[in-house]
């Protein structure tokens, strides 16, 4: 019986450790600046790193610019988006800007896309300053189902700061769905 | 056998509860305004409270102005930094400000420092207003190894809001490394 | 003995799963725009959805405009607040605005209210622009006791963006108190 108990304890530690790790998908994706779309209207950002520098992914999938949920659960989602402009880049088309981020969820089963979180600011980036910068941070707790996709849209993508510490988004699973 | 099973259940509840608590380091550090460093360029903030008001720490260490990781894991890191100026403090030497925060990770083994997250904004704090305020929030999910250190750098530290609800940073462990 | 072990494993899986879910209260509350207070001074927002769209709650209670903690623990709290104005809404009373959010904790046992987190910005929303927008995000890790209440105060509530992706706050339990 003692041996049996030891076996129970041992297998349980393994099982608990294994199931804990399996139960916690996460992703932290950083902007891939080699492929940022242009324009000033709202566009979906599809190029993100998932395996270099701070970028990482586990038990989730990154495909076609979207973060795909592989496991039902409640997740904390976040995004940090930095915009910047230096006068050496030339004049802005307009000095009045709407710098925005939208974190959206797409359900494949019922083809539909919904914004989970948005943030940003209208800015007056006058040509009188040599440098302009602005960052947005959003975060929230959402129920996600396997197969659902998370994507990030921004306005004025040509103004994005391409550093990995500046423009990124991510998710981590906090708990199962009852 | 029944008694044995009860013993297994009992010890497991204890073990599970104990290991769960041990496995979850956290810290929430609030600015210590009696010792804010000086300078207008980027400076490291080294004075933080860890045990008064909202400030707290568990299974992490605060030393020499840095938050030291004691346990490998994936952590959610965050910072909230507020800047403010009132005309009673005198005119600003420049009305054009770059108000920034940088959350950095230093590895002692390989002496190097890297920025994990940055945020902020350029601001025009005109003398036409008696009061100015601006807050930055950043957050992200990062793999941290025991011995690594997290620190916070800001521009214009003399403009920091010294309230514990205004200027703080923190971390909590979400999961183990596989 | 084998049967006994299987029984231990089975009951443990149930127990682990059940206790894990019970141990993780959460809430994500979205603004109820049908009942936003007016004025430009700091007011408490009392109308929030808890069961429609992205809004949800579990093992916490929403009552009288406050999020009530039912279970001691360390929680990650967050808020995202969006302000906006379009010229079609008429002129602003003042172009100089202080757009702020305060996340507060009220203890019933010792009747007192304390601000846990604050954020925002002073803004100059000139009549030269037809549209203005600004978002604030705050987040932090706090020890909460059963019976304590979390509420959100903002300045200029009449400028709040009523979308569920824009103005929300929430909490999720990360760990027990030792």
């Amino acid at each position: 019986i003692r041996a049996e108990k030891a076996m129970v304890d041992g297998s349980w530690l393994d099982l608990a450790k294994r199931s804990k790790l399996e139960a916690q998908p996460f992703a932290h994706l950083t902007i891939n600046a080699t492929n940022i779309p242009t324009g000033s209207h709202k566009v979906s950002l599809s190029s993100w790193y998932h395996d270099r520098g701070w970028a990482k992914i586990s038990n989730m999938t990154f495909s076609n610019g979207k973060l795909i949920v592989n496991q039902d659960g409640f997740y904390y989602l976040y995004a940090n988006i930095c915009f910047r402009h230096h006068e050496t880049s030339g004049d802005l088309a307009t000095e009045y800007l709407q710098l925005m981020v939208y974190v959206t969820k797409t359900s494949i089963k019922i083809p539909s896309s919904h914004t989970l979180m948005k943030g940003g600011s209208t800015k007056y980036w006058s040509g009188n300053s040599e440098f302009h910068f602005y960052s947005i941070n959003v975060g929230g707790f959402f129920k996600l189902r396997s197969g659902e996709e998370i994507s990030v849209e921004v306005s004025n993508p040509s103004l994005l700061d391409p550093d990995q510490d500046a423009t990124y988004f991510g998710a981590f699973k906090v708990r199962d769905i009852d | 056998i029944r008694a044995e099973k009860a013993m297994v259940d009992g010890s497991w509840l204890d073990l599970a509860k104990r290991s769960k608590l041990e496995a979850q380091p956290f810290a929430h550090l609030t600015i210590n305004a009696t010792n804010i460093p000086t300078g207008s360029h980027k400076v490291s903030l080294s004075s933080w409270y860890h045990d008064r008001g909202w400030a707290k720490i568990s299974n992490m260490t605060f030393s020499n102005g840095k938050l030291i990781v004691n346990q490998d894991g994936f952590y959610y890191l965050y910072a909230n930094i507020c800047f403010r100026h009132h005309e009673t403090s005198g005119d600003l030497a420049t009305e054009y400000l770059q108000l920034m925060v940088y959350v950095t990770k230093t590895s002692i083994k390989i002496p190097s420092s890297h920025t994990l997250m940055k945020g902020g904004s350029t601001k025009y704090w005109s003398g036409n207003s008696e009061f100015h305020f601006y807050s930055i929030n950043v957050g992200g999910f990062f793999k941290l190894r025991s011995g690594e250190e997290i620190s916070v750098e800001v521009s214009n530290p003399s403009l920091l809001d010294p309230d514990q609800d205004a200027t703080y940073f923190g971390a909590f462990k979400v999961r183990d490394i596989d | 003995i084998r049967a006994e072990k299987a029984m231990v494993d089975g009951s443990w899986l149930d127990l682990a799963k059940r206790s894990k879910l019970e141990a993780q209260p959460f809430a994500h509350l979205t603004i109820n725009a049908t009942n936003i207070p007016t004025g430009s001074h700091k007011v408490s927002l009392s109308s929030w959805y808890h069961d429609r769209g992205w809004a949800k709650i579990s093992n916490m209670t929403f009552s009288n405009g406050k999020l009530i903690v039912n279970q001691d623990g360390f929680y990650y709290l967050y808020a995202n607040i969006c302000f906006r104005h379009h010229e079609t809404s008429g002129d602003l009373a003042t172009e100089y605005l202080q757009l702020m959010v305060y996340v507060t904790k009220t203890s019933i046992k010792i009747p007192s209210s304390h601000t846990l987190m604050k954020g925002g910005s002073t803004k100059y929303w000139s009549g030269n622009s037809e549209f203005h927008f600004y978002s604030i995000n705050v987040g932090g890790f706090f020890k909460l006791r059963s019976g304590e209440e979390i509420s959100v105060e903002v300045s200029n509530p009449s400028l709040l963006d009523p979308d569920q992706d824009a103005t929300y706050f929430g909490a999720f339990k990360v760990r027990d108190i030792d």
Partner: antibody, heavy 119, light 107 residues
Framework: EVQLQQSGAELVKPGASVKLSCTTS????????IHWVQQRPEQGLEWIGR????????KYDSKFQGKATITADTSSNTAYLQLSSLTSEDTAVYFC????????????WGQGTTLTVSS | DIQMTQTTSSLSASLGDRVTISCSAS??????LNWYQQKPDGTVKLLIY???SLHSGVPSRFSGSGSGTDYSLTISSLEPEDIATYYC?????????FGAGTKLELK
């Protein structure tokens, strides 16, 4: 190349006014502050004030309020210092200098203009 | 207004000497301090900004330090072209104020 070129020496009578110029090149004047600094004979440097050419906003040391008026013409990239009701006390070298918006140091200076107030 | 005091109005040193020039403020200025060099011909140049940052093109023999109310400029090894007057300037608050200057001469 960044340059601040100041107008030539002036000899003026007490009670008169004078307008000194500082013509800039090699940078966008609207992205800077232009400052004026006085140096009396055998004395140190004294800040008079500054202008933000982008919007015309000015700040002065109270000692020079009413005495000095700083203006700028962005079309010609030129800043001006007008001094009124001159006395012998205003005899000095006047420097213009620039600082970038986000940094409060004078990284480039003009060569100085000598003003002599004498009857 | 914040008063800036350079107690030493003139200083004699030999080539190769290590020279330190001090400057004190009437109140704490949070490291908001710059150093300038004025040559005998009147030209003025920025040397050090924000207490210790070397301006581009300035030789590395120049360095700055200090905190609170007390600041200093150091020339590690005096060169002939360093003969000039040195001014500190605070930018903690308006009005911007300079020290009276320290004239560096050759022994």
């Amino acid at each position: 190349e960044v340059q601040l070129q100041q107008s030539g020496a002036e000899l003026v009578k007490p009670g008169a006014s004078v307008k000194l110029s500082c013509t800039t090149s090699g940078f966008n004047i609207k992205a800077t502050y232009i400052h004026w600094v006085q140096q009396r004979p055998e004395q140190g440097l004294e800040w008079i004030g500054r202008i933000d050419p982008a919007n015309g906003n000015t700040k002065y040391d109270s000692k020079f309020q009413g005495k000095a008026t700083i203006t700028a013409d962005t079309s010609s990239n030129t800043a001006y210092l007008q001094l009124s009701s001159l006395t012998s006390e205003d005899t000095a070298v006047y420097f213009c200098a620039r600082s970038l918006h986000y940094y409060v140091f004078f990284d480039y200076w003009g060569q100085g203009t000598t003003l002599t107030v004498s009857s | 207004d914040i008063q800036m005091t350079q107690t030493t109005s003139s200083l004699s040193a030999s080539l190769g000497d290590r020279v330190t020039i001090s400057c004190s403020a009437s109140q704490g200025i949070s490291n908001y301090l710059n150093w300038y060099q004025q040559k005998p011909d009147g030209t003025v140049k920025l040397l050090i900004y924000s207490t210790s940052s070397l301006h581009s093109g300035v030789p590395s023999r120049f360095s700055g330090s200090g905190s609170g109310t007390d600041y200093s400029l150091t020339i590690s090894s005096l060169e002939p072209e360093d003969i000039a007057t040195y001014y500190c300037q605070q930018y903690s608050k308006l009005p911007l104020t300079f020290g009276a200057g320290t004239k560096l001469e050759l022994k």
